[in-house]
Every structure is written in structure tokens, then in C-alpha cells.
Interface confidence: medium
């Protein structure tokens, strides 16, 4: 078994953030339906979020770390699918409703687990996979996400989520954290981030930064049995106007070395 | 349990290369940075080089830089130093350590510039 | 360059805290950490990184916080294993720099 519970994969690199379990391989998700149950409600949605978005950019100034920078965080938490484990598995679930947070503001990703047995503490692992699509772009035009639904339900696949089913070897990949007991260790990439894994699994960004944006896994594994590796996933975004990324983008370029 | 073990050090000639290397096991290699860090006899610690999880990120330390060539090998688990046009100050221990805030050391390797 | 005192003493049993200052600050806050070397070119341990965290195989009694751009290394309880000198690191811009070192005398 690896240390520091690292290099622990998702299934078969598919990023589809579904529980696995010998027992059980064929354990299909459940339909994500992550803006609503129609074109019309998910224009809604995206029109809600724009005016949002427009009245926290507006009232940015008064917020020391973020004066005159037009910008906001929208994170999106999608409760990824998870099957009824057999006895002895661990059950994975990262759930929370929508967030809307200003940039540099802290921001927490739950996630927690259950096992019906615990004879050693688990290995709690986050990692970051880049949007397979660009999700801020679509997020703006809202006909190309009709066009995508359509297609989507044309297919008969309307659980499909194309921001993040893609295989890794297109998008980037990196480990975030991982914890066993009280041990946190921070992946190479987000060394001097002040992010920890708190309370059951949850992950914590006291800041939020660009670059951020991208899926983020809760991976458990339990030692007693490396197979029952369960998953769930969580949507982050960062958005801002283009004055604001030109202002933003030179003071994260001090970070970790960098690939 | 995290290793770290240098090799390569030695009794060098000055205008002379060295190639140290450092063996990693025990934990995910390819995602944490590696440094090599140095003392002099009887000084503190100096930073030399650092490399990114990838290999494709590196930085030098000002008294290196332009001598110094540092690579790894995810593969093999191993980050390997290479300093050229040797000098006297070269003299030292050099440790391999594990991440930018690091967690982990090397027993280090002693090398001789004379 | 970072600051911190040549040397303190301590009682066994007491408390002692060695201060370092002059990080670099990276991402709107700074970033030390502490490592203790008990004799002249022998390995480092690290026993403080991120401020604040401690590695799992160090005791309880060695602690790190973070005031301002000063951090502070806190051992409660000092023992005669630790005596040794103590270099703080700071992280800055891909690099990593150390003091001078503090000897700590019990």
C-alpha cells in the first residue's frame, strides 16, 4: 500500500465519480441534473447567477483583500453518484448546495464517509482533474447549454456530465491532500496554499486563488480492503471579468515550481 | 515510512563535476517537489535547487545558478543534482529533501572540493 | 534573510519560544518552517512546516504559530534531547532560505 494514501486513481481514469466495489462493478450513477429539470429553468438559474454575480462584483471594494478586483467565486457542489455499498464498504458523499464566495475568501468542500467497521483510520484523498469542457464559458451562454441538453437527451444518456467525463490523459491531474488520522500532507502543486482537510473529509481552501477552478474528488480508502475505493466529486469554479484576471494572475505566479 | 538517500558525493577537483543522486521510496514520488539543500562545514543551510513534481519546473539558488542542473526520474523515484565548474565553497553536506515546505531529509552526502 | 537569535537557553521542563522573522509572503500570508540538527552536518529533522503543522513522529510538545510575518517555535516541556540548533526556513517564490540557526541550551 502507498504512503501518504497517494497515487490512488480513479477508476479506470474515467473521472465518472462512482463508488466501486468488487461486488458490485456494474453499479450504474444517477442522472445529474445539476441546472434544473429543463432549458427553461436552467436559463433561469444561469440569469440568477449573472445578476448575482453582477451585485457581489459591484460591491468588491469594500473587501481589503480584493479592492478594484472585479471578481467572484462560483462553486458548484454536485452530490456525485454513489450505490448502496455491501457490508464492509465505504460510502462517500459530497453534497452541499450551491455557493457563491468572493475571491480569496475561504471556501469548503464537504465530504464524508461511512464504514460499517473501522479497524485503522482511512486514507482521505482530494484531487484536482481540469474541466474537461469549459464550464465558464458555457456558463455564459446559455443556448450552447440547450444545444448540449438537447443532445444529451437526444442520446439517452441525460446523466452524462460533460465538464467531467473525460479521461485523464486530457486534462490535467494533480493530488490536492490526503489525510490518514491526524496527518495531513499537501500534493506538490498546492504547497504554501493554506489548504487542509477538516472535520470527516471536507476540504478546506482558506483562500481561494485562480487556477482553482476544476473537479474536485473525495477519495477513501480503507486498508482492509483497497478495492473499496468509494469517490464522489464536487464542482469548483472561479470566475471574473477580464480586467480583473489581467490584475489578478501576476501574484500567483510565486507559488510552487510550477510545470 | 518516507527514505531519502544520497549518493554521488566524494572528494572532487576544483573546475571538476559532480553528480549526486537521491533515492525516494516510500511515498507518491511524482507529486511532491524535491530540493537539495546544502551546509558548508561549520555554516548553517543554504538552498540549492528545487524541482517540480513533473520535472519540467526547476529553480536554482543564486551560488549555483548557471552551474548547477537539476532532474528526476519518476519512473526510478529519483532527483539527481548536477554541478559543474566546482569551487572550494562547494565543499559541503548536501541533503535531499522532500517538498517545497519541507516535511522529509536525506541523511546527506558529503562532498569534498580540493 | 531571516531573522532569529543565535542562541536561548531553557530549564528543563520549560518552556522556551525562538522567534523568526523576514519571510517571504506568498499568496497574501508567510510561510515557515523549522528544522532541528543536533550535531554539525548531521541529518535535519523537520519538526515544524506550513507554521504550524507538525510531522507525525515529532512530540506534541514542539508547536509553531504565525503572528504577523513572525513565526514562533514553542517547545513546552523542554527536554535534554532538545538541545540542538534550530533553523527556520521560509518559503518564497519557488525558493526556500534559512537562518543562521539558534542554539538552544538546556
Known amino acids: 500500500m502507498q504512503q501518504d494514501g497517494l497515487g490512488v486513481g480513479t477508476r479506470n481514469g474515467s473521472g465518472k465519480g462512482r463508488s466501486v466495489h468488487p461486488s458490485w462493478p456494474w453499479c450504474a450513477p444517477r442522472p445529474l441534473r445539476y441546472f434544473g429539470r429543463d432549458a427553461r429553468a436552467r436559463r433561469a438559474q444561469t440569469a440568477a447567477m449573472a445578476l448575482l454575480a453582477g451585485g457581489l462584483s459591484r460591491g468588491l471594494g469594500s473587501h481589503p483583500a480584493a479592492a478594484g478586483r472585479d471578481a467572484v467565486v462560483f462553486v458548484w457542489l454536485l452530490l456525485s453518484t454513489w450505490c448502496t455499498a455491501p457490508a464492509r464498504a465505504i460510502q462517500v458523499t459530497v453534497s452541499n448546495p450551491y455557493h457563491v464566495v468572493i475571491l480569496f475568501q475561504p471556501v469548503t468542500l464537504p465530504c464524508t464517509y461511512q464504514m460499517t467497521s473501522t479497524p485503522t483510520q482511512p486514507i482521505v484523498i482530494w484531487k484536482y482533474k481540469s474541466f474537461c469542457r469549459d464550464r465558464i464559458a458555457d456558463a455564459f451562454s446559455p443556448a450552447s447549454v440547450d444545444n448540449q441538453l438537447n443532445a444529451q437527451l437526444a442520446a439517452g444518456n441525460p446523466g452524462y456530465n460533460p465538464y467531467v467525463e473525460c479521461q485523464d490523459s486530457v486534462r490535467t491531474v494533480r493530488v490536492v491532500a490526503t489525510k490518514q488520522g491526524n496527518a495531513v500532507t499537501l500534493g506538490d502543486y498546492y504547497q504554501g496554499r493554506r489548504i487542509t482537510i477538516t472535520g470527516n473529509a471536507d476540504l478546506t481552501f482558506d483562500q481561494t486563488a485562480w487556477g482553482d477552478s476544476g473537479v474536485y474528488y473525495c477519495s477513501v480508502v480503507s486498508a482492509q480492503d483497497l478495492q473499496g475505493n468509494n469517490e464522489a466529486y464536487a464542482e469548483l469554479i472561479v470566475l471574473g471579468r477580464t480586467s480583473g484576471v489581467a490584475e489578478l494572475l501576476p501574484g500567483f505566479q510565486a507559488g510552487p515550481i510550477e510545470d | 515510512a518516507v527514505t531519502l538517500d544520497e549518493s554521488g558525493g566524494g572528494l572532487q577537483m576544483p573546475g571538476g563535476a559532480l553528480s549526486l543522486v537521491c533515492r525516494a521510496s516510500g511515498f507518491d514520488f511524482s507529486s511532491y517537489e524535491m530540493q537539495w539543500i546544502r551546509q558548508a562545514p561549520g555554516k548553517g543551510l543554504e538552498w540549492v535547487a528545487g524541482i517540480s513534481g513533473a520535472g519540467s519546473g526547476t529553480r536554482y539558488g543564486s551560488a549555483v545558478k548557471g552551474r548547477a542542473t537539476i532532474s528526476r526520474d519518476n519512473g526510478q523515484s529519483t532527483v539527481r543534482l548536477q554541478l559543474n565548474n566546482l569551487r572550494a565553497e562547494d565543499t559541503g553536506i548536501y541533503f535531499c529533501?522532500?517538498?517545497?515546505?519541507?516535511?522529509?531529509w536525506g541523511h546527506g552526502t558529503e562532498v569534498t572540493v580540493s | 534573510a531571516l531573522t532569529q537569535p543565535a542562541s536561548v537557553s531553557a530549564n528543563l521542563g520549560g518552556t522556551v519560544k525562538i522567534t523568526c522573522s523576514g519571510g517571504?509572503?506568498?499568496?497574501?500570508?508567510?510561510?515557515y518552517g523549522w528544522y532541528q540538527q543536533k550535531s554539525p552536518g548531521s541529518t535535519p529533522v523537520t519538526v515544524i512546516?506550513?507554521?504550524?503543522k507538525r510531522p507525525s513522529n515529532i512530540p506534541s510538545r514542539f508547536s509553531g504559530s504565525l503572528s504577523g510575518s513572525t513565526n514562533t517555535l514553542t517547545i513546552t516541556g523542554v527536554q535534554v534531547e532538545d538541545e540542538a540548533v534550530y533553523f527556520c526556513?521560509?518559503?518564497?517564490?519557488?525558493?526556500?532560505?534559512f537562518g543562521a540557526g539558534t542554539t538552544l541550551t538546556v
Open positions: 512546516y506550513w507554521n504550524d
Open positions: 526556513g521560509s518559503y518564497e517564490d519557488s525558493r526556500s532560505a
Open positions: 517571504g509572503r506568498y499568496a497574501e500570508s508567510y510561510y
Open positions: 529533501a522532500r517538498s517545497s515546505n519541507i516535511d522529509a
